[in-house]
Interface confidence: medium
């Protein structure tokens, strides 16, 4: 029998449309600087080759691994050395080292301008003239900006994008239809990107065990009626899917994700009562729907946890017989009973339980040693509860922008060495937790907030890893995945920091500020706030309030002036002088 061709297998499983989309995403995530047209050419060649192999699996090169085929194709790009420098060295390596080399050169911060929707008329014309190219360009633009984007999910968002243009390009007021819809989609895409980046970081930095533990907790909360073996099965499959996508194996990843959706839908009875609607949808929507499905109700027959994990005389025997399985059942049982807890908290509790058993099972009287273990959970539970309460109160008092600024001050004082753009980006995202989570009912606040914070702080870790400047960030990012947030929360102001020299250029503004969209205007103001703090880290809240108030008034005044540039040139230095005096 002819050797099974991997590329033919994936082409047949996925179908031509999805195959092409995924190959485009893969190439765009590896070669982020290449123009769209170059990628289209590579995708075309790859698809023709796959088609040939599907027709005749014994054809030349059809038996080669996907990594070999993809790598060979990437290494044919003419401008590799000029455009990518070191990345070209990867081409001198053999698989699997070559693919690993490509992965290490993925750039999390490629510096492309944010994706915006230009003139609706222009967009609609482009969409209607060549739909395939229009959607391909979207795939490419998102993938190159987000080199770890979850590829099958990006196919789903591209389908949504198509739906938006199909609807809005028929509308009388195209802009009124397109703007809110593309903006809402953009937000979803950004959150999706950050979530997957967190998953990839979990796998790459902390290994399968960390990712599996996170998934056991999450799926046990979602599917509390499923038994432990069922949850474990789903976790095993999910780990494989995300490992593949994070490793650049997008065809395998999408194929396995489809298989997983099929399995879930064929076994609804042993998983959840909430899946029927999702399972009636076509593939992309089905997978997305399953990923977002609401949690099932708790079964009525849940016994108190203490019976099995504290009072049972054989706790140490059960633990020592198979530590991972016993701890897995503990995490499963605890998580399904506590949908209101964050996954991060559940993992901290499991860690505490493990540490207690390690210590107690080595003593002469283990039961009396671990008998109070659940009491030791109290402070671990109260810490995030209090954090959410205090910060949501602050958010309600200040609003999103004010809350972002409070976080900006807090984090700049903690981590003054971190670059201003990174501090602004991360603090703005941290501030969005208020809008996203503080409006939710009490029972959903903690899991929403803490798990979102984990994703945002991962962005800080990823950006910092590229150019490390702070030992504190390195320590919080690398010591423990579940304790990242408490680690950052516990940091006080950095007393070792030497204030930055004052640079008037940093505080020089021009008339172009006036034409910026509101969000970008805010970023400019927030960058000034960070720079101010780096210059005067001991500034009080009152002083900062005064200076920022003056700054806001200055911008408003000059943007309303007849001669804007003249106003900025004249009033700017006065503002700087007043600010220096106020902070003296």
């Amino acid at each position: 029998e002819a050797q099974q061709s991997e590329i033919a297998h994936r082409y047949n499983d996925l179908g031509e449309e999805h195959f092409k989309g995924l190959v485009l995403v893969a190439f765009s995530q590896y070669l982020q600087q290449c123009p769209f047209e170059d990628h289209v050419k590579l995708v075309k060649e790859m698809t023709e080759f796959a088609k040939g192999c599907a027709a005749d699996q014994s054809g030349a090169d059809c038996g080669k691994s996907l990594h070999t085929l993809f790598g060979d194709k990437l290494c044919t790009v003419a401008s590799l050395r000029e455009k990518y420098g070191e990345l070209a060295d990867c081409c001198e390596k053999q698989e699997p080292e070559r693919n690993e080399c490509f992965l290490t050169h993925k750039d999390d911060n490629p510096g492309f301008p944010p994706l915006v929707t230009p003139d609706p008329e222009v967009m609609c014309t482009a969409f209607q003239e060549n739909e395939q190219q229009f959607l391909g360009k979207y795939l490419y633009e998102v993938a190159r900006r987000h080199p770890y984007f979850y590829a099958p999910e990006l196919l789903y968002y591209t389908q949504q994008y198509k739906g938006v243009f199909t609807e809005c390009c028929q509308a009388a007021d195209k802009a009124a239809c397109l703007t809110p819809k593309t903006e809402a989609l953009r937000e979803k895409v950004l959150v999706s990107s950050a979530r997957e980046r967190f998953k990839c970081a979990s796998l790459q930095k902390f290994g399968d065990r960390a990712f599996k533990a996170w998934s056991v907790a999450r799926l046990s909360q979602k599917f509390p009626k499923a038994d432990f073996a069922e949850v474990s099965k789903l976790v095993t499959d999910l780990t494989k899917v995300h490992k593949e996508c994070c490793h650049g194996d997008l065809l395998e990843c999408a194929d396995d994700r489809a298989d997983m959706a099929k399995y879930i839908c064929e076994n609804q009875d042993s998983i959840s009562t909430k899946l029927k609607e999702c399972c009636d949808k076509p593939l992309l929507e089905k997978s997305q729907c399953l990923a977002e499905v609401e949690r099932d109700e708790l079964p009525g027959d849940l016994t108190p946890l203490a019976a099995d994990f504290v009072e049972d005389k054989e706790v140490c025997k059960n633990y020592q017989e198979a530590k991972d399985v016993f701890l897995g059942t503990f995490l499963y049982e605890y998580s399904r009973r506590h949908p209101e807890y964050s996954v991060s908290l559940l993992l901290r509790l499991a860690k505490e339980y493990e540490a207690t058993l390690e210590k107690c099972c080595a003593t002469a009287d283990p039961p009396s040693c671990y008998g109070k273990v659940f009491d030791e959970f109290k402070p671990l539970v109260e810490e995030p509860q209090n954090l959410v309460k205090v910060n949501c109160e602050l958010f309600e008092k200040l609003g999103e922008y004010g809350f972002q600024n409070a976080l900006l001050v807090r984090y700049t004082k903690k981590l003054p060495q971190v670059s201003t753009p990174t501090l602004v980006e991360v603090s703005r995202k941290l501030g969005k937790v208020g809008t996203k989570c503080c409006t939710k009912p009490e029972t959903e606040r903690m899991s929403c907030a803490e798990d979102y914070l984990a994703v945002v702080l991962n962005r800080l870790c990823v950006l910092h890893e590229k150019t490390p400047v702070s030992d504190r960030v390195t320590k919080c990012c690398s010591e423990s995945l579940v304790n990242r947030r408490p680690c950052f929360s516990a940091l006080a102001g950095d007393e070792t920091y030497v204030p930055k020299e004052f640079n008037a250029e940093t505080f020089t503004f021009h008339a172009d500020l006036c034409t910026l969209p509101d969000a970008e205007k805010q970023v400019k103001k927030q960058s000034a706030l960070v720079e101010l703090l780096k210059h005067k880290p001991k500034a009080t809240e009152e002083q900062l309030k005064t200076v920022m108030g003056d700054f806001g008034a200055f911008v408003d005044k000059c943007c309303a002036a007849e001669n804007k540039e003249g106003c900025f040139a004249e009033e700017g230095p006065k503002l700087v002088a007043a600010a220096q005096a106020a902070l003296a």
Partner: nanobody, 119 residues
Framework: EVQLLESGGGLVQPGGSLRLSCAAS????????MLWVRQAPGKGLEWVSV????????YYADSVKGRFTISRDNSKNTLYLQMNSLRAEDTAVYYC????????????WGQGTLVTVSS
């Protein structure tokens, strides 16, 4: 009613191998996770291995990891345990059991089959 019938036990020398089988009836085998448990003379029950209804994932007690392999054939309603590199401490009555709806305990088990490892 649920019936589980184990077979394949016997006397074997240390380092030897045995393959246990468990024929299941009275419930939908292909939607049930299954496990093997054992009881050494004068000792309590110890779980050995678990297998999901689909055949993966599988779990093993630390004491048998790398030596024992659990598998199943859903078309034959049969569960297996391949035991290699047997040791004296593996001597026990081996039972197959139906996995419960929650904890790492078990609902039903069969009559058992005795495995004796001795030179």
């Amino acid at each position: 009613e649920v019936q589980l019938l184990e077979s394949g036990g016997g006397l074997v020398q240390p380092g030897g191998s045995l393959r246990l089988s468990c024929a299941a009836s009275g419930f939908t085998f292909d939607t049930s996770s299954m496990l093997w448990v054992r009881q050494a003379p004068g000792k309590g029950l110890e779980w050995v291995s678990v297998i999901h209804q689909s055949g993966t994932p599988t779990y093993y007690a630390d004491s048998v990891k790398g030596r024992f392999t659990i598998s199943r054939d859903n078309s034959k309603n049969t569960l297996y345990l391949q035991m290699n590199s047997l040791r004296a401490e593996d001597t026990a009555v081996y039972y197959c059991a139906k996995f419960p709806s929650s904890r790492m305990k078990f609902d039903y088990w069969g009559q058992g089959t005795l495995v004796t490892v001795s030179s």
